[in-house]
Amino acid sequence: MMTGTIETTGNISAEKGGSIILQCHLSSTTAQVTQVNWEQQDQLLAICNADLGWHISPSFKDRVAPGPGLGLTLQSLTVNDTGEYFCIYHTYPDGTYTGRIFLEVLESSVAEHGARFQIP
């Protein structure tokens, strides 16, 4: 039975040209995290594998940095980066947990972080 929950940074905004940390946290389970996939719609950004380290998709290699932790840092933001991002936690023995983050990249300097929320 899957008892865990994914806590994410929720809805966030950032300035064009700036950077943002995409972060998820798995709680309420003792399951072992074996891999985390970071995806934007149907595009893979990166994989963090507990044994192997990081695989960064070449399409993003100049703008994506691994970490902190299992998170992902997105740099040199453009308005095209606006959209949904997913952290997909592969765990043993629970299975897969998915968290969602919505990022809005703003032209102005009025970027504020949204509240944290949980996905059961």
């Epitope: 893979l44 192997l52 695989h55 070449p58 290699k61 592969h90």
Partner: antibody, heavy 127, light 112 residues
Framework: QVQLQESGPGLVKPSETLSLTCIVS??????????WSWIRQHPGKGLEWIGY???????YYNPSLKSRVIISVDTTKNQFSLKLSSMTAADTAVYYC???????????????????WGQGPTVTVSS | EIVLTQTPLSLSVTPGQPASISCKSS???????????LSWYLQKPGLPPQVLIY???NRFSGVPDRFSGSGSGTDFTLKISRVEAEDVGVYYC?????????FGGGTKVEIK
């Protein structure tokens, strides 16, 4: 020498779920140097990659199929499996399992070529 | 996803003559680690594909030295220096630098 052998039904009814298993012999699926893939080939057509699994359970699926695909691994039986749901005639194909090499260096890893392939059963979707 | 385009679609070769197959990528397969993850496969009739070349130019164990691979960026080539009867089949290139893995459409090689 590692060998892969697929097993599963040759005929599936429309809307049903295809279940295939790939048995690994001559080596351990727990080797950290490899990823394990499923690939299919429609009749007279080219090759389409379905997805991969690592021995510890990490997966990635082709976005074109990901809503219908589950790949799992059973290290105790030295095998990995494919489930493809909501089958239609368009899913009629030869389904191959294959082993790919992983290159890991300095905290990063990369996917290399597919060096061992199963024989691939033909799966037909028909009522 | 990365699209790989192979040319020609088919090739009819006299035994002992050379053959060349091109694989062009929709985006650069620029390596992050100094290696380009482009491989070549031969699928003989009724059999699964078998790897010939990995990482652009490395011959897989047991592959005859008449097969060679080259290229960089977006343009890659498989050459057979002297085609033999056993070389008939469909040749595929595959990239694994970016997921999903993708294959070229294939080049059918037959003997004249």
């Amino acid at each position: 020498q590692v060998q892969l052998q697929e097993s599963g039904p040759g005929l599936v009814k429309p809307s049903e779920t295809l279940s295939l298993t790939c048995i690994v012999s001559g080596g351990s699926i727990r080797s950290g140097d490899y990823y394990w893939s499923w690939i299919r080939q429609h009749p007279g057509k080219g090759l389409e990659w379905i997805g991969y699994i690592y021995y510890s359970g990490g997966t990635y699926y082709n976005p074109s199929l990901k809503s219908r695909v589950i790949i799992s691994v059973d290290t105790t039986k030295n095998q990995f499996s494919l489930k493809l749901s909501s089958m239609t005639a368009a899913d009629t194909a030869v389904y191959y399992c294959a082993r790919g090499s992983i290159a890991a260096r300095s905290g990063y890893f990369y996917f290399s070529g597919l060096d061992v392939w199963g024989q691939g059963p033909t799966v037909t979707v028909s009522s | 996803e990365i699209v790989l385009t192979q040319t020609p679609l088919s090739l009819s070769v006299t035994p002992g003559q050379p053959a060349s197959i091109s694989c062009k990528s929709s985006q650069s397969l620029l390596p992050s680690d100094g290696k380009t993850y482009l491989s070549w496969y031969l699928q003989k009739p009724g059999l699964p594909p078998q790897v010939l070349i990995y990482e652009v130019s490395n011959r897989f164990s047991g592959v005859p030295d008449r097969f060679s691979g080259s290229g960089s960026g977006t343009d890659f080539t498989l050459k057979i220096s002297r085609v033999e009867a056993e070389d008939v089949g469909v040749y595929y290139c595959m990239q694994s630098i970016q997921l999903p893995l993708t294959f070229g459409g294939g080049t059918k090689v037959e003997i004249k």
